[in-house]
Interface confidence: low
Amino acid sequence: MSLLSVPHTESVSLSTGSTVTIEARPLVCFFNEPHLQVDFHTEMKEDSDIAFHFQVYFGNRVVMNSREYRTWKEEVESKNMPFQDGQEFELRILVLEDKYQVMVNGQAYYNFNHRIPVSSVKMVQVWRDISLTKFNVSN
């Protein structure tokens, strides 16, 4: 299976009911503390506002946040860590009416209430210490 380049940036148009699907694998073992970062940007540039920031510190914790007017807001942290060392995973981000729901390998683990309208999201970026095999948006 061919790998997608990382960072992977894609133009998107999201609404309630949209699903972002990512299949990937950590590049290194958890002992070396790899990260995964997924950002839902409001513009097609990396320094734009972020409606949903999802960062996995593999083997440790997950952090979710938003960035508005170049300022990070209140962080939401979870210690739930369903990712397994060295294993491929499927991440699905569901856009619900009131929140983003993040599923790992088919199970819901994380929720993040909307702070910025979903209709503002123009670009999704997936990056950091992963090999990426799939990125898909379904509306």
Partner: nanobody
Amino acid sequence: ELQVVESGGGLVQAGDSLRLSCAVSGRTFSSYHMMWFRQAPGKEREFVAAIAWRGGTYCANSVKGRCTISRDNAKDTVYLQMNSLKPEDTAVYFCAASLRYVFDPSAMDYWGKGTLVTVSS
């Protein structure tokens, strides 16, 4: 294959402390995340505390500040220290092992049979 056996339960007074032990037999103990859950009569099993294979710890809000979880990989044992016990801590305490650091009973790979803790007022 892991075998999980809890011990240390019993009858204690409110305000007392208790240390539960969880002995695990199996060659790969050190690669498992270890969790404690509890189940009070007539209630669902609830997460209490976790310790990752690398040693990171987490206690549920219901026991935060009163809970210490530790592991001794040389002895293949996990410990749960509970301080300032309350009558509502009365439950069967279960030790579990998982390859995923997830605080959900359905995610556990191996379970012990439990040890009863009764806190009297």
